[in-house]
């Protein structure tokens, strides 16, 4: 009996389409692999960005696979081709692996690059990213902002940059259709007479960096002696009212009586008929239905009741 | 309909230099690997360079290693070869190839004729 | 280098009959050979690879066999328009080489 051997992949690369971190990685079928015509060859797929402790596994009768990654960092990639032990009458064949790396060359020292980037999805509406050039920088560096996401053909520059004493700091990004749950990718790079500028690389979801407004038309409703309802409306624009947590901050008589986090638009409040100044302020933010992090918004304007019993009569602002 | 058209090709002298183009449609060109062959006046073909889908493997037989450089844009879908220090056995009819799964030759362009020759 | 060899540079045939064009490695390229056709002022068109499988489009009147160092391509039921030079190729290592050329004649 001959021992059946199946060859690893070839050609196996890391392809770059300029997508600012979404990598294809592409193979060609190994050779000889028409003695296996009828079995299904499958690929074992395992990569990572260089520095990672953990590799990405996939299994895949395909020739290709995409995902994103750290352009920041370096990547590097294994593949090999299994025959499942249908075709072998036995145990599982495996060729040798093929391996292969990529990373772009950096330019710059790291001190160049922009320094704290934030970005904030306002509302779920309006997408602004401010940074801070990079340490010993002279003026006449600017940075140029790119971003592309899944649906865009191409990566795209931003048209509408914040700018201070000349300098690109921010950008204040168009109506970005259908992208959100889905990553997004951004380079920060940067041009100067005078010295290199080595680039940045981002990658966050929309729907994670949403920035919601405060909530509006705060109310206090009495309930019984001794209970108020406090009410309030989820605060106008897109986002949908299961998505939002909300934090309410409650004051008695200049006292912080009750720091409450609710999911709905009302809170019950126990209270003494003593109570003669009753306020509070409620913020929002995006749940983790909807969402795996978020910005709480602003506290919304302070709505009070005071001088007359709260028992009396409900009370509206 | 996978289509590939050569062009570039002409008459020049020996040491000098010649860039043929190839352009690719039919198919997505990023997948796949492609080939420049040649076809000499006595009618032997002679692989002259291959290039992975990707562009980040490179192919040569020695006879040209060195003086031909494959490349390719996928943005554009267009292959090329450039070809320095030419020689009068570079005179060829050259053909554009996309090459298939398996490392054969599935479609070819028409070809571009070069001629070396003072 | 591998060098693919097709001894028989001309064959002559009638149309109907069977003809078998052979190639051989000068070593062993498993199944690793395409063969290809090109009729006069065309360029080359993919007939077989893997040794014995046809490009999809391709006649069952053409059949690849062989593996190692000898490889054969048949055509059955030779038509005129099979008038052609038949190429063998192999790509189990670089550099990818061809054999000679057959050219097919039609009495």
């Known amino acids: 009996d001959t021992e059946i051997k199946v060859n690893p992949p070839q050609d196996f690369e890391i392809v770059d389409p300029g997508y600012l971190g979404y990598l294809y990685l592409q193979w060609q079928p190994p050779l000889s692999l028409d003695h296996f015509k009828e079995c299904t060859v499958e690929y074992e797929l395992k990569y990572r960005n260089i520095g990672s402790e953990t590799w990405k596994t996939i299994i895949t009768k395909n020739l290709h696979y995409k995902d994103g990654f750290d352009l920041n960092k370096g990547i590097e990639a294994k593949i090999h081709t299994l025959l499942p032990w249908q075709c072998t009458n036995g145990s599982e064949v495996q060729s040798s692996w093929a391996e292969t790396t990529y990373w772009i060359s950096p330019q710059g020292i790291p001190e160049t690059k922009v320094q704290d980037m934030d970005c904030v999805y306002y509302n779920w509406q309006y997408l602004l990213c401010s940074w801070k050039p990079g340490i010993g920088v002279l003026l006449d560096t600017n940075y140029n902002l790119f971003y592309w996401y899944e649906g865009l053909d191409h990566a795209l520059q931003c048209v509408d940059y914040i700018k201070a004493d000349g300098q690109n700091i921010g950008c204040r990004f168009p109506y970005l259709e259908a992208s959100d749950y889905k990553d997004f990718y951004i380079c920060v790079n940067g041009s100067s007479e005078n010295k290199p500028i080595r680039s940045s690389y981002f990658t966050f979801q929309l729907q994670n960096i949403v920035k919601p407004l405060p909530p509006v038309y705060l109310t206090f409703t009495r309930e019984s002696s001794c209970e108020i309802k406090l009410k309030w409306s989820i605060p106008l624009g897109p986002i949908p009212a299961r998505c939002f947590d909300y934090e309410i901050e409650i004051r008695e008589d200049d006292t912080t009586l009750v720091t409450a986090t609710v999911e709905n638009e009302t809170y019950t409040l126990k209270t003494t008929n003593e109570t003669r100044q009753l306020c509070f302020v409620v913020r929002s933010k995006v749940n983790i239905y909807c969402s795996d992090d978020g910005i709480w918004s602003e506290w919304s304007d302070k709505q009070c009741w005071e001088g007359e019993d709260l028992s009396k009569k409900t009370l509206l602002r | 309909e996978v289509k590939l058209v050569e062009s570039g090709g002409g008459l020049v002298k020996p040491g000098g230099s010649l860039k043929l183009s190839c352009a690719a449609s039919?198919?997505?060109?990023?997948?796949?690997?492609m080939s420049w062959v040649r076809q000499t006046p006595e009618k032997r073909l002679e692989w002259v360079a291959t290039i992975s889908g990707g562009g980040s493997y490179t192919y040569y037989p020695d006879s040209v290693k060195g003086r031909f450089t494959i490349s390719r844009d996928n943005a554009r879908n267009n292959l090329y070869l450039q070809m320095n220090s030419l020689r009068s056995e570079d005179t060829a009819l050259y053909y554009c190839?996309?090459?298939?799964?398996?490392?054969?030759?599935?479609?070819w362009g028409q070809g571009t004729s070069v001629t070396v020759s003072s | 280098d591998i060098v693919m060899t097709q001894s028989q540079k001309f064959m002559s045939t009638s149309v109907g009959d069977r003809v078998s064009v052979t190639c051989k490695a000068s070593?062993?390229?498993?199944?690793?050979v395409a063969w290809y056709q090109q009729k006069p002022g065309q360029s080359p068109k993919a007939l077989i690879y893997?040794?014995?499988y046809r490009y999809s489009g391709v006649p069952d009147r053409f059949t690849g066999s062989g593996s190692g160092t000898d490889f054969t391509l048949t055509i059955s039921n030779v038509q005129s328009e099979d008038l052609a030079e038949f190429f063998c190729?192999?790509?189990?290592?670089?550099?990818?080489?061809f054999g000679g050329g057959t050219k097919l004649e039609i009495k």
């Open positions: 190839a996309r090459r298939d799964l398996r490392s054969a030759m599935d479609y």
């Open positions: 070593q062993n390229v498993d199944i690793n």
């Open positions: 039919g198919f997505t060109f990023s997948s796949y690997g």
């Open positions: 893997s040794a014995s």
């Open positions: 190729q192999q790509y189990n290592s670089y550099p990818l080489t």
